[in-house]
Interface confidence: low
């Protein structure tokens, strides 16, 4: 399918001039950023963006690529080098720690500096690295995270915690040596570290003693939950602030966010992670946009300004189950939650941050038509005489054998949700990849997102575009009509 | 385009049971929610059960709740909803449906099959 208009130059020449009439237009703004927003795609490589963008546009019943994803609007653009301390490939604690608190660490740790070990708790104390979230709410910021997944998860975490292992989610995971050296499990380190006016996501089991049966599945004993210290940590909470709110559904969210008298809010969805966006019941679960609105309603209230992290955590799941239907479903919701956000807020005031902590083995290639669908199969037959999908994993639980040869594929397999996409090598889990990622940036300081760049200078462009520690004396210019 | 086909119905006594076939062509239930439905005489037409295509969420009104049983064989497009213990206010029309999510009006079911009666005598 060939759009008649783009056989003709003018159409491209037209197109291309209007864009740069847009970028001569670009003024790098010269005052602070007021709040600050950092949208985190997990795993959200740059060929996730490309498959997914084709996918928002087949949903609306475009051929697909010429779409723009809300994110594609963003003016500056950077690559971030994700590797870890000691990996080439790292993993969500260690990017967590680069992107939130300005410094590189150690596979699987989180908030803390290259120097601690994972799973050594001895090595924790004196490491400790502070989040730019942190920074914001000792500079009288309103602070919040927001999360599909639980919100103990390592995504979340770097923004709070320090922990020698991201698993140690609580106390029932943490070993028994450790608990009595000190180290506190993620979720201890949730309501303990410092004041989340906003805390949005899954993760309801780590909070209760073992016992305690889950409201939502409450005949599940593997729901319920888990703590061994008998501590209720979400009543822990609710008893330091006296306007604070702990909500477990979508219609107690909604109502909380619109109440005045709700200072601080707590809305955990599910036990675990919440469920992908595909499978979720509307009518218990909220999606992220909703709970990214949700966040910003309260956050806004303040005069100073905010804080928020928006993770689009189970992208990374469904390329870890090679079910790219999955990954880009969710990488779709992520973006319509960053859509909304921006309908919400000024970028005026706003500095807004997209980017991913790393990226999967996700390929997409074998010189598809366009308008064919992203789920669909490439023209022609392999080397095998058999057909073979666009979307393709390096490794996974994709690859099987059938009588020691590669099976078939037709286009109805691979369009269902379930399908996993084949891989060159068999892994239980599909692996994440090192390459670098793109940082997106919008809003006061935006123009500072450039080039190739450690993923810690993202960390510090937040600081610096808000005044905030170590950029105090940023000697920016504070948007007119600012109250303090 | 999803079709949806109904089957199973018929007249059985209180306490038998009956199982209920939605079969979809035109394409897979994929990220569908199916949904099964009744409408007694005279009244609206009421929620009975649903689940997404994996399983992974089931919910049931509370008046069919450890009676019936709905579930999805993906390999044969097929929704089942397992009567048991049926009772002659669960007489109805049953329809099934293919729901998706809109981030408007939440889960909503755009698709439905032409009924089938079920009939509990006393």
């Known amino acids: 399918i060939i759009p008649v208009e783009e056989e003709n130059p003018d159409f491209w020449n037209r197109q291309a001039a209007e864009a740069l009439g847009a970028a001569k237009k670009l003024q790098p703004a010269q005052t602070a950023a007021k709040n600050l927003i950092i949208f985190l795609g997990d795993g959200m490589g740059v060929s996730t963006v490309t498959a997914a963008r084709i996918l928002k546009g087949q949903k609306k019943d475009k051929l697909g690529p010429e779409t723009f994803l809300a994110m594609d609007r963003f003016p500056y653009v950077a690559l971030s080098k994700t590797y870890s301390v000691d990996k080439h490939v790292p993993d969500s604690g260690a990017t967590a720690t680069a992107y939130l608190c300005g410094v590189k660490g150690n596979f699987q740790t989180i908030g803390l500096s290259a120097a601690a070990r994972f799973n050594q708790c001895n090595t924790t104390r004196g490491n400790e690295v502070i989040s730019v979230m942190n920074r914001a709410k000792k500079a009288g910021k309103s602070v919040g995270v927001v999360t599909t997944t639980r919100v103990q998860h390592a995504s979340p975490a770097g923004a709070y915690a320090h922990t020698v292992n991201r698993n140690w989610y609580s106390d029932a995971d943490v070993p028994a040596s450790a608990r009595q050296e000190g180290c506190q499990d993620i979720a201890t380190q949730l309501i303990s570290n410092m004041d989340i006016d906003v805390i949005l996501g899954g993760g309801r089991k780590y909070m209760f003693p073992m016992g305690t049966p889950d409201p939502e599945y409450p005949d599940d004993y593997s729901q319920g939950g888990t703590r061994l210290d008998g501590k209720n940590l979400v009543q822990e909470w609710l008893a330091k602030h006296q306007g604070a709110r702990y909500v477990w559904n979508r219609t107690e969210l909604l109502q909380a966010s619109l109440d005045p008298s709700v200072t601080h809010l707590m809305g955990l969805f599910e036990p675990g992670d919440m469920k992908y966006e595909i499978h979720r019941d509307s009518t218990l679960d909220p999606s992220l946009m909703e709970m990214t609105e949700a966040a910003l309603l309260l956050l806004s209230r303040n005069p100073r300004g905010f804080f928020l992290f928006v993770e689009g955590g189970r992208i990374d799941h469904g390329h870890h189950e090679s079910r790219a239907y999955r990954a880009l479903t969710e990488t779709i919701m992520f973006d319509d939650a960053i859509e909304r956000a921006g309908q919400l807020t000024s970028e005026e005031d706003t500095l807004s941050l997209v980017t991913a902590d790393h990226s999967h083995v996700f390929s997409f290639g074998g010189y598809p038509l366009r308008g064919s669908s992203i789920f669909g199969l490439a023209p022609g037959k392999a080397r095998d005489r058999k057909a073979y999908t666009v979307l393709l994993y390096g490794n996974g639980p994709g690859y099987v054998l059938k009588d020691g040869a590669r099976p078939d594929v037709t286009e109805s397999e691979s369009g269902s949700p379930e399908y996993r996409q084949q891989s060159a090598v068999p892994l239980d889990g599909e692996t994440h990849a090192g390459e670098d990622v793109a940082v997106f940036a919008r809003g006061p300081q935006a123009h500072l997102v450039h080039g190739v760049q450690e993923q810690t200078f993202i960390a510090h462009v937040m600081a610096f575009a808000a005044c905030l520690e170590p950029y105090t004396a940023c000697d920016l210019a504070p948007r007119a009509g600012t109250t303090d | 385009q999803v079709q949806l086909v109904e089957s199973g119905g018929g007249l059985v006594q209180a306490g038998g049971s009956l199982r209920l076939s939605c079969a979809a062509s035109g394409r897979a239930f994929g990220d569908y929610n199916i949904g099964w439905f009744r409408q007694a005489p005279g009244k609206e037409r009421e929620f009975v059960a649903r689940?997404?295509?994996?399983?992974?969420?089931?919910r049931y009104d509370d008046s069919v709740k450890g009676r019936f049983t709905v579930s999805i064989d993906n390999a044969k497009n097929t929704a089942y909803l397992q009567m048991n213990s049926l009772k002659t206010e669960d007489t109805a029309v049953y329809y099934c449906?293919?729901?998706?999510?809109?981030?408007?009006?939440?889960?909503?079911?755009?698709?439905w099959g032409q009924g089938t009666q079920v009939t509990v005598s006393s």
């Open positions: 449906a293919a729901g998706r999510y809109s981030r408007v009006r939440g889960w909503e079911y755009d698709y």
């Open positions: 689940r997404t295509w994996d399983g992974s969420s089931t």
